[in-house]
């Protein structure tokens, strides 16, 4: 029976993934009962990705390692719509690391997942980035401009946002 074997495979995958993320929240995508997309609980989902707001305060490097151990990366923001989704889950009095850095301090910004940096899809606060020694990017709230990006020193502990592709089972 096709449906039975599909269910057995799905349960097997769930068991395999459970040691890394003990609880998954899954939805059926489209009309096909075969396609389930999942995010770890309590991650949030938007389009084809899952997001986790890490409230522990860590340096940029440690924040990225924390994400990667979970099978994710610090968030790479590709569109205004994605940023608008993300900020719904952020606190205005906090700052959060993005997966964006300038390791050489030469204003060669690069995303942690090698996505090409596109100047046309950036959301820097006005006047930012403004310091060659500030080589990591955060997203934070300024009352005059709402949410935007700022460059800061990478060693200064911040909260962070992890992102990974949805898990398909």
């Amino acid at each position: 029976n096709f449906m039975y074997s599909k269910t057995v495979k799905r349960l097997s995958k769930l068991r395999e993934y459970q040691q890394y993320h003990p609880s998954l929240t899954c939805v059926m995508e489209g009309k096909d009962i075969e396609d389930w997309s999942c995010c770890p609980t309590p991650w949030t989902s938007f389009q084809s990705s899952c997001y986790f707001i890490s409230t522990g305060m860590q340096s940029w490097t440690k924040s990225q390692k924390n994400c990667s151990v979970m099978g994710a990366d610090l968030v790479v923001i590709n569109t205004r719509e994605e940023q608008d989704f993300i900020i719904q889950n952020l606190k205005r009095n906090s700052s959060y690391f993005l997966g964006l850095s300038d390791p050489g301090g030469r204003r060669h910004w690069q995303w942690v997942d090698q996505t090409p940096y596109n100047e046309n899809v950036t959301f820097w606060h006005s006047g930012e980035p403004n310091n060659l020694d500030e080589r990591c990017a955060i997203i934070n709230f300024r009352s005059s401009e709402e949410w935007g990006w700022n460059d800061i020193h990478c060693h200064v502990p911040q909260k962070s946002i992890c992102k990974m592709k949805k898990i398909y089972i």
């Epitope: 395999e16 390692k65 990366d73 942690v112 090698q114 990974m164």
Partner: nanobody, 127 residues
Amino acid sequence: QVQLQESGGGLVQAGDSLRLSCAASGDTFSMYTMGWFRQAPGKEREFVAAISRSGGSTNYRDSVKGRFTISRDNDLNAGYLQMNSLKPEDTAVYYCALRLTFSTTTAYTGELQYPYWGQGTQVTVSS
């Protein structure tokens, strides 16, 4: 906790071949994307090759395409880097790295995307 151990490095002549191995322990190897990176003296560590969980997807840096082949054996908890037509500029310490992933087809290329690293094995290519 994942542990990695590279082997197979050595001193060879330009044009020769070497096969590097990476033995993994501590977790289910098939849940991890594997990458090889290298660091030459005085230079930054750079991506060499990566292979997806299933082995079906690979990525290579341009300078090694056609000469190096990455592979893995999930039953043996091991990964490999076959290096042919070696050049003096391939001289470096070679590191294997692992990254948990839930996609069977993704081969990550970013150094910071890999949290688990081996100690490295030295490859020296003389002219």
